[in-house]
């Protein structure tokens, strides 16, 4: 049985601190107790779990680095979402740092796309 295929109605209500595992798994926002008898709620703002699981520990919430802004805060079921500050972007091949966007295009080229948190400006050759 995949975690997603379990009946959503059997998930613990948000206010519940503890519930019983379903087929050995606990719902998102929880982890399993070490005797497998209970599902224990993750701590809001500290840790989370996104799927049905048998984790002994919830996953630690990410803390945004300097140079990043928090777009979505961590909940018990979703990790923090961090984004590069304005004027910087995160490259696919080096996702751990935010790099400064170029301020302009080289001579003979024109900007066709602005800087975003995910990409540098895009330049194309001017039509002659």
């Amino acid at each position: 049985i995949t975690r997603q295929s379990l009946d959503p109605q059997r998930r613990a209500a948000p206010q519940q601190k503890r519930s019983s595992p379903t087929e050995g798994l606990c719902p998102p926002g929880h982890h399993i107790s070490e005797d497998s008898r209970e599902c224990i709620s993750c701590k809001y703002g500290q840790d989370y779990s996104t799927h049905w699981n048998d984790f002994l520990f919830c996953l630690r919430c990410t803390k945004c680095d300097s140079g990043e802004v928090e777009v979505n805060s961590c909940t018990t079921t979703r990790n923090t979402v961090c984004q590069c500050e304005e004027g910087t972007f995160r490259e696919e091949d080096s996702p751990e740092i935010c790099r400064k966007c170029r301020t302009g295009c080289p001579r003979g080229m024109v900007k066709v796309k602005d800087c975003t948190p995910w990409s540098d400006i895009e330049c194309v050759h001017k039509e002659s």
């Epitope: 050995g24 399993i32 070490e34 005797d35 497998s36 840790d47 699981n53 048998d54 002994l56 520990f57």
Partner: antibody
Framework: EVQLLESGGGLVQPGGSLRLSCAAS????????MSWVRQAPGKGLEWVSA????????YYADSVKGRFTISRDNSKNTLYLQMNSLRAEDMAVYYC??????????WGQGTLVTVSS | EIVLTQSPGTLSLSPGERATLSCRAS???????LAWYQQKPGQAPRLLIY???SRATGIPDRFSGSGSGTDFTLTISRLEPEDFAVYYC?????????FGQGTKVEIK
């Protein structure tokens, strides 16, 4: 009565491998998280690894990550620790323990792993 | 990682005296995940206290645990000859699970 009996320790050369086993009895093995804890000669206790009751989730100390693998066979009531790329600093008595986060409420007698050339 | 620092390193006391052992955490630890163990030479550790203050099965009531946050204490109200050993605190609040370096309680 809860009993944990480790085996598989011994002398191994640096870079070598060893598999420790822990035979459990006296409790519903498949329900409980289990751990390995080690103690170097004359030193304190160091947690090595833990595994959930079903075996679906595993955790490791940074010092052994990528080299050691914890596993369990619930049909045999047995816990394992596969140790690869052994180093001098891995030399210790290895204890199998019932539990993980809240406490280690039962311990085996330990098995000695000696890493030496 | 949460570092647990135990003090003192060695405690020299006489039978009948009170022993107070400290365990200080580098970050806040949930009381539910703080335990104390006793270990005698050549033996496996034995669980004394779990959940910071609950005595494990068969542990005499002269052993008690207290504390919260970053400061925890194990108290042995009246030391018996069999209590001279090394004591360790352990946290499971967040991975990796860690132990303190131990406090040796020796006969004065």
């Amino acid at each position: 009565e809860v009993q944990l009996l480790e085996s598989g320790g011994g002398l191994v050369q640096p870079g070598g491998s060893l598999r420790l086993s822990c035979a459990a009895s006296g409790f519903t093995f498949s329900s409980y998280a289990m751990s390995w804890v080690r103690q170097a000669p004359g030193k304190g206790l160091e947690w090595v690894s833990a595994i959930s009751g079903s075996g679906g989730s595993t955790y490791y100390a940074d010092s052994v990550k990528g080299r050691f693998t914890i596993s369990r066979d619930n049909s045999k009531n047995t816990l394992y620790l596969q140790m690869n790329s052994l180093r001098a600093e891995d030399m210790a008595v290895y204890y199998c323990a019932k539990g993980a986060r809240v406490s280690f409420d039962y311990w085996g007698q330990g098995t000695l792993v000696t890493v030496s050339s | 990682e949460i570092v647990l620092t135990q003090s003192p390193g060695t405690l020299s006391l006489s039978p009948g005296e009170r022993a107070t052992l400290s365990c200080r955490a580098s970050q806040s630890v949930s009381s539910s995940y703080l335990a104390w163990y006793q270990q005698k030479p050549g033996q496996a550790p034995r669980l004394l206290i779990y959940g910071a203050s609950s005595r494990a099965t068969g542990i005499p009531d002269r052993f008690s645990g207290s504390g919260s946050g970053t400061d925890f204490t194990l108290t042995i109200s009246r030391l018996e000859p069999e209590d001279f050993a090394v004591y360790y605190c352990q946290q499971g609040s967040q991975p990796p699970i860690t132990f303190g370096q131990g406090t040796k309680v020796e006969i004065k």
